[in-house]
């Protein structure tokens, strides 16, 4: 078959499964004169051969774990052995079969965990390797806890990340582990290849011994601090302690206050730095954080609660300079006139803000003093004697003492005696007819004027008219404002009208007074009026079920994956067509009919997450009205960014000659997301030839120390290649270079000769 099994000399790639006994040729290359024979070079491992006539074949089973790719070259030679064509690259990709079992790096692991550690934060990693291809299920490992000893009430206290092998506490473990009850646990962990999904997978087990240690990183009890303290500040109010010495403590103001009156020292003692004012702020909640020497948090922050205790430092205040009440002249003994509500800024429901009311003066004292009484705690004024006569005294002024346990304040009340409310409001019309409005009539529009009259004393609560819609408007779309001078009522639209839910509304208005009617008089039909409102349809835009739609997917989802969907309805019931707007990265497409959103390109969290686009719903037919909603696609991270140096390390130097081995610290980072445990880089010297002179040791997940192994270095620049592995799934690795100069040192560090430059003395 020309093309598949034979053909001219050109670059080619062939895939062969490992472990298969050689059974057939790989390819037959055809020679063109003057070529008469072929030559095979490269990674043949004495397995791959080529016959004189161009027959490429292999002589024994391949092993991917020995070599996963054989890079060969084939050249066509003339009769003198000179190359006349090529050499061209021929790549043999050895495809993996599951011929290796996973193996734990240790048969026993030991670790410790503090009680109350954050659930899900690994405190120990088990690690297994499988020589098979990690890009296939054959080399994809899955970890599992097989046994937990002891097991209390059948509750698992430990969990394992089946991909990373990170062992952490469960929620129950975080809450219930107690070294006083059970100081140690044993886990049996299994690892399976084939992603743990196949009956044919290979497995291995290991044992993990875990010691539970006491956690002293605990939130202290809430603190109570008296306001306006006169003691010298700062005052220690509480403390936190990290489990090991050397932590760096800081406080984080949860509420971003303009003034944050707390501090913490490096022992973990927390202080209030200035007097507090409960009336400004009655409680503070902030966090205490413990970090390592590189500024990385050691654990979750602790919440510190400070409650400010009240002292009586505020007098009562009157509601206004003069409080005005009305009383009808025929009101009976004991009737309530109104309540004086003074205020005290001290803590509510305490003695500091409990107010006492007392009338200290009444003017005029006609026909006698003591016409009014006030309820001591409620401040309610009542009629204490007989009914009042407007023609005798139309107005009374009261001076009322309002006191808390330490302060007294005088408030002033004016009581106007008004005519009795024996007349009801009477509508000019009992029927205001009907009105037709479009459903999109503006909110706030006045649609009708209504009028009732009341024969009681003008400009008093007896004659003032309040209008209410008492029937036909359960949604509260209408309201009525009253002109206080004319008692005219203006019917306004308070909420949008809606043809679809209320095409016809039979409205009933009621007119009433703020003052009660006298005994024996009641509102009758004259105080009611009706009105019919017809609402006409307006074609309205579709309505989305949500203003913002949100979805979450992994950044490595396959192209064509459904990542979310949106829904909208048209009030008139028309069909809807969906489209996207603002898909600047060209990542998405939307099904016009269903609103389902699919990926059409590779997604990248590091380019920005969430990715925000607008979705547009448009009526099909009609006037093609549309509305817009937001679609936010949250991309979860996969490990697709190799490690790199966190910054440019330009001026790394040692003073020459070295008196003792030296070291320097550098930091790595990558652009992937590191929830919970942060980055977990491992570091190694990349070149064997450098390992005699240099060593690299890990400090924490992001920092490492590069050290010299001896002192015998020349006065020159050395380039040290360091391999950084991010330990992700799959692990990504990169090689970075640090340039380290060994130089003579002056007072200001490295002294480098300037060299000859125009105009610059050396």
């Amino acid at each position: 078959q020309e093309g598949k099994f034979s053909g001219p000399l050109k670059p080619m790639t062939f895939s062969i499964y490992e472990g298969q006994e050689p059974s057939q040729i790989i390819f037959q290359f055809k020679a063109n004169p003057p070529a008469v024979t072929f030559e095979l070079t490269g990674e043949t491992d004495n397995i791959f051969k080529i016959e004189r006539e161009g027959l490429l074949y292999y002589t024994k089973a391949l092993d991917r774990e020995t070599r996963s790719t054989h890079n060969l070259q084939v050249a066509a030679l003339d009769a003198n052995g000179a190359i006349v064509e090529g050499p061209v690259p021929i790549t043999i990709e050895v495809k993996d079969v599951n011929d290796n079992r996973p193996t734990f790096l240790q048969s026993k692991y030991e670790g410790s965990v503090r009680q109350n550690s954050r659930p899900g934060k690994p405190f120990l990693y088990v690690n297994a390797t499988d020589l098979d291809d990690p890009a296939t299920p054959n080399g994809q490992l899955s970890y599992q806890i097989v046994i937990q000893l002891p097991m209390i009430n059948n509750v698992m206290y430990f969990q394992i990340n089946n991909k990373t092998g990170g062992i952490s506490l469960t929620r129950e473990g975080s809450q219930e582990l107690n070294p006083a009850k059970n100081p140690s646990y044993n886990l049996v962990i299994s690892v399976k290849d084939m992603g743990g999904q196949s009956e044919n997978s290979f497995s291995d087990t290991t044992s993990v011994d875990i010691i539970v240690t006491e956690n002293i990183w605990k939130a202290p009890e809430p603190v109570e601090m008296v306001e306006n303290s006169t003691d010298p500040h700062p005052i220690k109010i509480t403390q936190v302690r990290w489990n090991d010495p050397g932590a760096q403590y800081s406080l984080v103001d949860k509420e971003k206050l303009p003034r944050f009156p707390f501090s913490i020292d490096q022992e973990g003692d927390i202080y209030v730095t200035q007097p507090l004012d409960r009336e400004e702020k009655d409680a503070y909640v902030f966090y205490a954080v413990a970090k390592d020497e590189y500024g990385k948090p050691l654990s979750y922050p602790l919440e510190i609660h400070v409650k400010v205790q009240d002292i009586n430092d505020n007098p009562p205040t009157c509601p206004s300079p003069v409080t005005v009440f009305e009383v009808q002249e025929n009101e009976r003994l004991g009737n309530s006139i109104g309540a004086l509500t003074a205020h005290d800024s001290d803590e509510e429901n305490t003695a500091n803000s409990l107010l006492n009311y007392r009338i200290v003066e009444q003017t005029p004292k006609l026909p006698m003093d003591g016409l009014f009484l006030i309820q001591t705690y409620a401040g309610m004024l009542q009629l204490a004697k007989q009914s009042l006569k407007k023609q005798d005294t139309p107005q009374y002024n009261l001076t009322i003492e309002v006191s808390d346990k330490d302060f007294k304040t005088l408030c002033f009340v004016q009581i106007n005696v008004i005519d009795i409310n024996d007349q009801i409001p009477i509508f000019e019309k009992s029927d205001y007819g009907n009105l037709t409005l479009a459903e999109d009539t503006n909110v706030g529009s006045t649609i009708l004027t209504i009028q009732a009259t009341d024969a009681d004393e003008p400009f008093t609560g007896s004659s003032k008219i309040l209008y209410h819609v008492i029937k036909g408007d359960s949604e509260g779309r209408l309201g009525v404002d009253t002109d206080p001078h004319t008692n005219t009522g203006y019917v306004i639209i308070k909420k949008p009208l809606d043809f679809e839910t209320a095409a016809i509304s039979n409205i009933v208005f009621k007119a009433e007074n703020p003052e009660p009617l006298v005994f024996g008089v009641t509102y009758n039909a004259s105080s009611f009026a009706k009105f019919t409102l017809f609402v006409t349809d307006v074609n309205e835009a579709p309505e989305f079920s949500q203003y913002v739609f949100q979805a979450k997917v992994s950044e490595d989802v396959a192209i064509g994956t459904k990542v979310g969907n949106v829904t909208a309805k048209d009030p008139e019931g028309l069909d809807i067509s969906y489209s996207l707007r603002g898909d600047t990265r060209g990542w998405l497409k939307i099904d016009h009919v269903t609103g389902e959103i699919f990926s059409v390109a590779p997604l990248d969290r590091e380019a920005g997450s969430p990715y925000r686009v607008q979705v547009v719903a448009t009526e099909v037919g009609g006037s093609s009205l549309s509305s817009v909603s937001q679609f936010h696609l949250i991309l979860t991270d996969v490990n697709d960014n190799p490690p790199r140096l966190a910054k440019d390390y330009m001026d790394l130097y040692f003073c020459h000659p070295l008196s003792a081995p030296g070291s320097l610290i550098f930091e790595a980072t990558d652009d992937d997301q590191h929830l919970f445990r942060g980055p977990h880089f491992t570091f190694s010297i990349a070149s064997e030839s450098l390992q005699n002179d240099w060593q690299v040791s890990k400090i924490n997940g992001t920092h490492a120390r590069l050290s010299t192994r001896h002192t015998d270095f020349e006065e020159k620049e050395y380039v040290v290649s360091i391999r950084i592995n991010d330990g992700g799934r799959p692990p990504l690795e990169s090689t970075v270079s640090l340039t380290v100069t060994f130089c003579s040192c002056g007072e200001d560090g490295c002294f480098r000769p300037a060299g000859h430059q125009p105009g610059i003395p050396t």
């Epitope: 004169p33 070079t41 000179a82």
Partner: antibody, heavy 119, light 112 residues
Amino acid sequence: QVQLVQSGAEVKKPGASVKVSCKASGYTFTDHTIHWMRQRPGQGLEWIGYIYPRDGYTKYNEKFKDRATLTADTSTSTAYMELRSLRSDDTAVYYCARFYYGYWYFDVWGQGTTVTVSS
Amino acid sequence: DIVMTQSPLSLPVTPGEPASISCRSSKSLLRSNGNTYLYWFLQKPGQSPQVLIYRMSNLASGVPDRFSGSGSGTDFTLKISRVEAEDVGVYYCMQHLEYPFTFGQGTKLEIK
């Protein structure tokens, strides 16, 4: 045993042509290439070109491409080198040699043919 | 064309003493298959050339083992461990990596 026997000495006038033969024996003539070299008096060796008797393919040194023709007669296992438009500086000993296929070296040389170009 | 340069051009040697001839090429003769396409031969007085060393270091059949070849991609050496009277003649190096094949100028070995 393997041997190459060349034709005898030639004396030619300038502008004439000469055709030197090289008869092979002791091996399969079509398996190996035959190369032609010359050595001028007191000088080093120069490569003229080669012929592959199996298919008659030839390759020449650019310097001789327009004047030299290499041929082979497989029926008599004989290779020929013809040089045209002779000049006095073509006076030399002309050698044929077998280039050993697969080992890639000159393993057998002819005894040489002296060509003298003189007016 | 690849230029081949030999040194010395004349080499007087006492019988039983070692001798060494150098050859340099203007381009590396090492090919990706690991072979170096350099050839040494000897032309004794009045005779046709005869092979000594092929592919830089391989001793041809019938050649005494006092002859050896070595070198890198561009610098090559032919060594005779103990010169004998029959070794006199002109020694040539030749490259056959590329056409045209080219020769060194030759080194004349004579007995002191």
